[in-house]
C-alpha cells in the first residue's frame, strides 16, 4: 500500500492503491547538496547524475572508518524521497548530486557556498529548464550563506531547505533563515511536529510550511535494493522539493514567488497540533502541511496571498519591526501585534522603491511584530493614502479616491503611548467600503490598489467586550488581503491574517478586571480578481 | 611539505605584486564588519570568507586577496587563498590567523568577513 507520507501529500482525486500523480517533474532538474550517494541503487539508478563536485571537511576522530554505505546513507535516502521509482515524490525528476557533507554528515559554510557557486556556473554554461536546489543541511545563522542563497534565488533557482532538527527557532539557523529559500519543518503521520530524541523540528516565522518527516521510507545505501525509514527536516524538505519539481514541470514559467504562494495555498491548513511549539512561537509558525495541487493547471485565476511576520522589534521604544514582501509580491496590507498590548500601531511606507510594513513599539519592553499581507497581483498599481490624526472629530478616516482603485488594507499609527486612555472609541460608518476609519489621535493609512478586474469588500465581526480573540473569514472564492481591528484601544493586542481568516487578539476583560463597554471588531478586506478568473477560463 | 611550498610560492607572488603597485589605496567610508557563528562548537576559526562589495570584479577580488597576503607577510604571517568566489558573491576564502582580521577588514572593497562554520545533515 502507499506509504503514509505519499498519501499525505496526495490530493484525494489521485488517491488509489498507488501514488501516481500526473507528470513526475520530468522538465525539472533537482540539485542535491548532501553526502555522497549510491547512484546505482534501483530507486534512483539513471535518475541521479553524480557531479564531480566535492568539498567536505575531514571526518572527526583519528580512528574513523570510512564505510561506503554509511557515507552515502543520508544523500541516497533523500534522492530516493525526491525522485525514487517506488517511494519518490517526483518520479520523473532528474537529479544532480554535489558532495558537501562528509561521512559523518558534516560540512562547512564555505563548502556549501562553493557548491552553490558551482550550480550557478553550471546554469550559466548550460541553461536547462527550471532548477530546484535541495539543501538538507543546517548550521548557525550565516550572513554569507543567506546572501548566496538570495543571489541564486534571484537568478531564478528555487531553493528548498530543512528547517533544522534543533527544536528551536529556525531563524537562528542557515540557510533556513534566508527569506528567499523555502524552509520546511517536519510533521509525522499524526500531523504532530516531529520529535527527534530530545529535540525535534524547528519552528517559527522562518518556516514556510511543514511536510512529512518521520518514518519516511526511502532508498537505503546498505544494498542496491534496500529500503530504510529515516526522519528529519531533510526528509520533509525532500518532499517539498519533489512537489516543487512537479509544479514546475506542469508550469515551467512559475516564479519563485508564485511557487511559494501555491505551495502555501494547496497545503493542508490547521492540522498541526500547535501545543507542541513554545507558546510565543505558535502565532508565528505556519500551520501548513505541504500537498500537491488537486490539478496541475488552473490555479492561475486565484488571488494568492500569504502572511509574513517580521522579527521581534526588541525591547526599547526606539526599536521598530519591519515585515517585507518578496520582490514580485505586492504589500496589500500591514498590521501589528504585541503580546503586552503596548504598541503604537503600524504603517506602510516606501523603502528602496518598495512598500514595507513597519510596526512601532511602545514602552514596557515587550516589543512588537509587524505583519505584512503579501499577494501576487499582476499589473497592480498600489499606493498608500494617509490621513493625519483628526484630533477634534469623532475619528480619523481616509479613503481611496483615485478612479478604479480599491481598498485592500487599513493601518493606523499613533504617537500617544496608550490610546485606551484617550476616548471616545470610533464607530464605523456603514456603507463606505473604500474607507479606513480609526481613532481620532491616530494617523490612518489606506492601501489602495488598481489592478485589472480587482474587486474587494469589507467584512466585519464585532463582539461586545474584549474576549481574547475575534475572527472574521473571507468566503470561498475571495482572498483575505487586509486585517485590522476597531477600535485601536489598549485592549487590542493586534491583528493578523491566518490563511483566509482575520484574527484580532485582545486582552480578556475577565483577567484585566475592566468593565469596558467597548466592542472589539475584526475587519477583513476580502478581494478577488475577475480578470485572473476570466483569463483562466479562456485558457480552458 | 607540499602545502608549505605552495604557501611560500603564493607569498612570494603576493609580495612581488605589492611592489609592482597592483594594490589600490583603501577606501574610506563604512567599516566592514566581522561575523561569526553564535554557536561556539560550530565555529571554524582560521578559515574566513571575505565578502567584497556587490559590484566587485573577479580581477579586483584576486587583487584584494593578494594584497591581504602581502600585508600579512610583512607582519610575518602565512596565509593561503583557498578559493576565489565569483558568479554568486564576489570574495575569497582564506586560511589565516585571526590576528589578521583587523587588517583584512580595512582592505578595499571588503563588505564583511565571516568566520567559517560547520553545517550538518538534518
Amino acid at each position: 500500500s502507499i506509504p503514509w507520507n505519499l498519501e499525505r501529500i496526495t490530493p484525494p482525486r489521485y488517491r488509489a492503491d498507488e501514488y501516481q500523480p500526473p507528470d513526475g517533474g520530468s522538465l525539472v532538474e533537482v540539485y542535491l547538496l548532501d553526502t555522497s550517494i549510491q547512484s546505482d541503487h534501483r530507486e534512483i539508478e539513471g535518475r541521479v547524475m553524480v557531479t564531480d563536485f566535492e568539498n567536505v571537511p575531514e571526518e572527526d576522530g583519528t580512528r574513523f572508518h570510512r564505510q561506503a554505505s554509511k557515507c552515502d546513507s543520508h544523500g541516497t535516502h533523500l534522492a530516493g524521497v525526491v525522485s525514487g521509482r517506488d517511494a519518490g515524490v517526483a518520479k520523473g525528476a532528474s537529479m544532480r548530486s554535489l558532495r558537501v557533507l562528509n561521512c559523518q554528515g558534516k560540512g562547512t559554510v564555505s563548502g556549501t557556498l562553493i557548491g552553490l557557486e558551482f550550480i550557478r556556473k553550471s546554469q550559466l554554461v548550460q541553461p536547462v529548464g527550471p532548477l530546484v536546489v535541495l539543501l538538507p543541511l543546517a548550521g548557525g545563522y550565516s550572513r554569507v550563506l543567506n546572501a548566496a542563497c538570495q543571489r541564486l534565488a534571484r537568478a531564478g533557482v528555487v531553493l528548498v531547505t530543512a528547517a533544522g532538527n534543533f527544536r528551536d527557532d529556525a531563524c537562528l539557523y542557515s540557510p533556513a533563515s534566508a527569506p528567499e529559500v523555502i524552509t520546511v519543518g517536519a510533521t509525522n503521520a499524526q500531523d504532530q511536529p516531529v520529535t527527534l530524541g530530545t529535540l525535534g523540528t524547528n519552528f517559527g516565522r522562518c518556516v514556510d510550511l511543514f511536510a512529512p518527516g518521520e518514518d519516511i521510507i526511502g532508498a537505503s545505501s546498505d544494498c542496491s535494493t534496500c529500503f530504510v525509514s529515516q526522519s528529519g527536516t531533510s526528509q520533509a524538505a525532500a518532499h517539498v522539493a519533489g512537489i516543487a519539481a512537479m509544479m514546475l514541470s506542469a508550469e515551467p514559467e512559475l516564479t519563485l514567488a508564485e511557487l511559494r504562494q501555491r505551495l502555501i495555498h494547496f497545503s493542508a491548513k490547521d492540522v498541526i497540533n500547535e501545543a507542541w511549539f513554545p507558546e510565543d512561537q505558535r502565532v508565528l509558525t505556519p500551520n501548513l502541511v505541504a500537498a500537491l495541487p488537486p490539478s496541475t493547471h488552473g490555479a492561475g485565476w486565484q488571488l494568492f496571498c500569504r502572511t509574513v511576520w517580521s522579527a521581534h522589534s526588541g525591547p526599547t521604544r526606539m526599536a521598530t519591526a519591519i515585515a517585507r514582501c518578496a520582490p514580485d509580491e505586492e504589500l496589500l496590507s500591514c498590521s501589528s501585534f504585541s503580546r503586552s498590548g503596548k504598541r503604537r500601531g503600524e504603517r506602510m511606507e516606501a523603502q528602496g522603491g518598495k512598500l514595507v510594513c513597519r510596526a512601532h513599539n511602545a514602552f514596557g519592553g515587550e516589543g512588537v511584530y509587524a505583519i505584512a499581507r503579501c499577494c501576487l497581483l499582476p499589473q497592480a498599481n498600489c499606493s498608500v493614502h494617509t490621513a493625519p490624526p483628526a484630533e477634534a472629530s469623532m475619528g480619523t478616516r481616509v479613503h481611496c479616491h483615485q478612479q478604479g482603485h480599491v481598498l485592500t488594507g487599513c493601518s493606523s499609527h499613533w504617537e500617544v503611548e496608550d490610546l485606551g486612555t484617550h476616548k471616545p472609541p470610533v464607530l464605523r460608518p456603514r456603507g463606505q467600503p473604500n474607507q479606513c476609519v480609526g481613532h481620532r489621535e491616530a494617523s490612518i493609512h489606506a492601501s489602495c490598489c488598481h489592478a485589472p478586474g480587482l474587486e474587494c469588500k469589507v467584512k466585519e465581526h464585532g463582539i461586545p467586550a474584549p474576549q481574547g480573540q475575534v475572527t472574521v473569514a473571507c468566503e470561498e472564492g475571495w482572498t483575505l488581503t487586509g486585517c485590522s481591528a476597531l477600535p485601536g484601544t489598549s485592549h487590542v493586542l493586534g491583528a493578523y491574517a491566518v490563511d483566509n481568516t482575520c484574527v484580532v487578539r485582545s486582552r480578556d476583560v475577565s483577567t484585566t478586571g475592566s468593565t469596558s463597554e467597548e466592542a472589539v471588531t475584526a475587519v477583513a478586506i476580502c478581494c478577488r480578481s475577475r480578470h485572473l478568473a476570466q483569463a483562466s477560463q479562456e485558457l480552458q | 611539505q607540499e602545502d608549505e611550498d605552495g604557501d611560500y610560492e603564493e607569498l612570494v607572488l603576493a609580495l612581488r605584486s605589492e611592489e609592482d603597485g597592483l594594490a589600490e589605496a583603501p577606501e574610506h567610508g563604512t567599516t566592514a564588519t566581522f561575523h561569526r557563528c553564535a554557536k561556539d562548537p560550530w565555529r571554524l576559526p582560521g578559515t574566513y570568507v571575505v565578502v567584497l562589495k556587490e559590484e566587485t570584479h573577479l580581477s579586483q577580488s584576486e587583487r584584494t586577496a593578494r594584497r591581504l597576503q602581502a600585508q600579512a607577510a610583512r607582519r610575518g604571517y602565512l596565509t593561503k587563498i583557498l578559493h576565489v568566489f565569483h558568479g554568486l558573491l564576489p570574495g575569497f576564502l582564506v586560511k589565516m590567523s585571526g590576528d589578521l582580521l583587523e587588517l583584512a577588514l580595512k582592505l578595499p572593497h571588503v563588505d564583511y568577513i565571516e568566520e567559517d562554520s560547520s553545517v550538518f545533515a538534518q
Epitope: A311, S313, G314, P315, T316, R317, M318, A319, T320, I322, S340, R358, F363, G364, G365, E366, G367, E415, E417 | -
Partner: antibody, heavy 117, light 110 residues
Framework: EVQLLESGGGLVQPGGSLRLSCAAS????????MSWVRQAPGKGLEWVST????????YYADSVKGRFTISRDNSKNTLYLQMNSLRAEDTAVYYC??????????WGQGTLVTVSS | QSVLTQPPSVSAAPGQKVTISCSGS????????VSWYQQLPGTAPKLLIY???KRPSGIPDRFSGSNSGTSATLGITGLQTGDEADYYC???????????FGGGTKLTVL
C-alpha cells in the same frame, strides 16, 4: 518624582563577582523596561543589558553575554545586575536607566565598579 | 569602535549654531528611532531628543533632531556656555539585537 538609586559597586578582583542593585521609585516600576548602561573612565556610553517590564524578555551586549544576568523584582521595585567572571575591561560607572530612548527615559547617578588585582 | 560614528569634537562661539552628526547603517539608524543625550561633566546622561526629532518636556527648542537615511543630526542654536558637554546619539540595532551608542562628541563653547 522619578528616582533611580544604584548600589553594589566597588573593587573586585578579576574573575570575581558582584551584584548591582537599582532601587526605583516615583513610577509604576513593572510597566517599564529597565536597562544597565556603563561608562568606562574617560570613555563613551556602552549598553550592557535590558529587561522588559514583566521580566519575560532579556537582552545582553555580546561583551557580557554568559557572564552577566539582568533581573528584576517588581514587588520590591528593584532592578539587579549579577556580574560574574569580571574582567579589567568591565571597570566602569554602571548606570541604571528607565525606558532608554523614550519620553520616559531617566537615568540614575551611577555606581562605580573597579576590577583590578 | 562604536557602531554609530560621531565626530570626536565640535566647537562654536556663544549664540552660534552647531550640528553634530551621527552615522550608522540600515540595521540601526536606517530602520529605528534615534535618541540624543547630553552628559554634563560628572553627571548622568540626560535625554534631549527621542523618536528622531521630539523633545521631552523641559528641553528647550534650541535643541532639534533630524534624520535622513542612515544618518542623524543634532542641532543646537543660540549656544550657551552651559551647553558644554558630551553628546551621544543612540538607537536600537536590529541585527545586533542591542542598544548602540555613538562614541560621543565633545562640544566646546568658545
Amino acid at each position: 518624582e522619578v528616582q533611580l538609586l544604584e548600589s553594589g559597586g566597588g573593587l573586585v578582583q578579576p574573575g570575581g563577582s558582584l551584584r548591582l542593585s537599582c532601587a526605583a521609585s516615583g513610577f509604576t516600576f513593572s510597566s517599564y523596561a529597565m536597562s544597565w548602561v556603563r561608562q568606562a573612565p574617560g570613555k563613551g556610553l556602552e549598553w550592557v543589558s535590558t529587561i522588559s517590564g514583566s521580566g519575560g524578555r532579556t537582552y545582553y551586549a555580546d561583551s557580557v553575554k554568559g557572564r552577566f544576568t539582568i533581573s528584576r523584582d517588581n514587588s520590591k521595585n528593584t532592578l539587579y545586575l549579577q556580574m560574574n567572571s569580571l574582567r579589567a575591561e568591565d571597570t566602569a560607572v554602571y548606570y541604571c536607566a528607565k525606558e532608554v530612548g523614550s519620553p520616559f527615559d531617566y537615568w540614575g547617578q551611577g555606581t562605580l565598579v573597579t576590577v583590578s588585582s | 569602535q562604536s557602531v554609530l560614528t560621531q565626530p570626536p569634537s565640535v566647537s562654536a562661539a556663544p549664540g552660534q549654531k552647531v550640528t553634530i552628526s551621527c552615522s550608522g547603517s540600515n540595521s540601526n539608524i536606517g530602520n529605528n528611532y534615534v535618541s540624543w543625550y547630553q552628559q554634563l561633566p560628572g553627571t548622568a546622561p540626560k535625554l534631549l531628543i527621542y523618536d528622531n526629532n521630539k523633545r521631552p518636556s523641559g528641553i528647550p527648542d534650541r535643541f532639534s533632531g533630524s534624520n535622513s537615511g542612515t544618518s542623524a543630526t543634532l542641532g543646537i542654536t543660540g549656544l550657551q556656555t552651559g551647553d558644554e558637554a558630551d553628546y551621544y546619539c543612540g538607537t536600537w540595532d536590529s541585527s545586533l539585537s542591542a542598544v548602540v551608542f555613538g562614541g560621543g562628541t565633545k562640544l566646546t563653547v568658545l
